[in-house]
């Protein structure tokens, strides 16, 4: 369960890939599209509001006999729109929604090497936001094997 309904902190940051491509958001035909692209030098990076929530993870689920806490985030590039996992389509989409947000809008935050982070679907453990064919997609990762895979690594910069 997510502790309380308000985030423990929020920050505005631009999101880029391990390879320094920018995640950008464009309004097209009354819906938002998400792109992964090289930005021209003078172009301003899109900012995302990251809201951080503390989630209690009961020992019955944790598998190691102790309660734990996770840090979860929601990502909102513009008012009332949030990134959401579409597990059926293995896609990442922007949806307009009201609070309380659906579970599909929450991602477990992982610290990674090179001061990168990864975003794991709350609704589908082992599935992460990643980059595929210049778009964001949901990527299944074998935790024991390949957590260093660059396509699920992101940089946050204020």
């Amino acid at each position: 369960s997510i502790t309380g309904i308000s985030p423990i902190t929020e920050s505005l940051a631009s999101l880029s890939t391990y390879n320094d491509q920018s995640i950008t958001f464009a309004l097209e035909d009354e819906s938002y599209e998400i792109y992964v692209e090289d930005l021209k030098k003078d172009k301003k990076k899109d900012k995302v509001l990251l809201s951080y929530y503390e989630s209690q993870h009961p020992s019955s689920e944790s598998g190691d006999g102790v309660d734990g806490k996770m840090l979860m985030v929601t990502l909102s590039p513009t008012k009332d729109f949030w990134l959401q996992a579409n597990n059926k389509e293995h896609s990442v989409e922007l949806h307009k929604c009201e609070k309380p947000l659906p579970d599909q809008a929450f991602f477990v935050l992982h610290n990674r090497s090179f001061n990168c982070v990864s975003f794991e679907c709350k609704t589908d453990p082992g599935v992460f936001i990643g980059v595929k064919d210049n778009h964001l997609a949901l990527i299944k990762v074998d935790y024991s094997e390949n957590l260093g895979s660059e396509n699920i690594l992101f940089k946050l910069s204020e």
């Epitope: 423990i8 902190t9 806490k69 992982h110 610290n111 990674r112 260093g148």
Partner: antibody, heavy 121, light 107 residues
């Protein structure tokens, strides 16, 4: 309950390699990062490095060329190796566990009791 | 690397006093700051995380504030068991650097 216990030789000769082990219980190394921190006598805390839940490592820039952190998941152990030691490496060495699953943002909630390592011939 | 500067390096205070310790980061770290208490011969104890969150079991006389580069630890009414050394630590980016410490001594 959660426990971390440092172990290793209390005396190391200059130019040799300092080797310490942190044995953990009550949690899984695949879910939590484990950090090494040291404290020279009468001085402040210095972060040495981390072994993250996903297996990647991060190190103090000043020590990076001499330090290696690794784990043996089957034994629930995280090891620290610091090569080419000098008297300046004399310190109490601590291991500590992240507050959050998978993330270091929440600080270190559980600490070992620390072990004093003296570098002297 | 991010430098953390604590002030003062020591403070003399009496039981019941309000004590304030500040920590300045050399670049913005959002809310990713922790405060620890350490007593002689003991391991550090987490007091505050995410700049303002009280760790489990920590008395409510301890509080944290700030974000970005400027942070404060406040002890609202100093108790005998609070005489110790306090450290801040940034957790925004590796290496996770500590401040140099503030010793709270009996006046």
């Amino acid at each position: 309950q959660v426990q971390l216990q440092e172990s290793g030789p209390g005396l190391v000769k200059p130019s040799e390699t300092l080797s310490l082990t942190c044995t953990v219980s009550g949690f899984s190394l695949s879910k939590y990062g484990v950090h090494w921190i040291r404290q020279p006598p009468g001085k402040g805390l210095e972060w040495i490095g981390v072994l993250r839940a996903g297996g990647s490592t991060g190190y103090n820039s000043a020590l990076m060329s001499r330090v290696t952190i690794s784990k043996d998941t089957s034994k629930s152990q995280v090891s620290l190796k610091l090569s080419s030691v000098t008297a300046a490496d004399t310190a109490v060495y601590y291991c500590a566990r992240d507050h959050y699953y998978y993330s270091s943002y929440g600080g270190f909630v559980y600490w070992g009791q620390g072990t004093l390592v003296t570098v002297s011939s | 690397d991010i430098q953390m500067t604590q002030s003062p390096s020591s403070v003399s205070a009496s039981v019941g006093d309000r004590v304030t310790i500040t920590c300045l980061a050399s670049q913005t770290i959002g809310a990713w700051l922790a405060w620890y208490q350490q007593k002689p011969g003991k391991s550090p104890k987490l007091l505050i995380y995410a700049a303002t969150r009280l760790a489990d079991g920590v008395p409510s006389r301890f509080s944290g504030s700030g974000s970005g580069t400027d942070f404060t630890l406040t002890i609202s009414s100093l108790q005998p068991e609070d005489f110790a050394t306090y450290y801040c630590q940034q957790l925004d980016s590796s290496p996770y650097t500590f401040g140099q410490g503030t010793k709270v001594e009996i006046k």
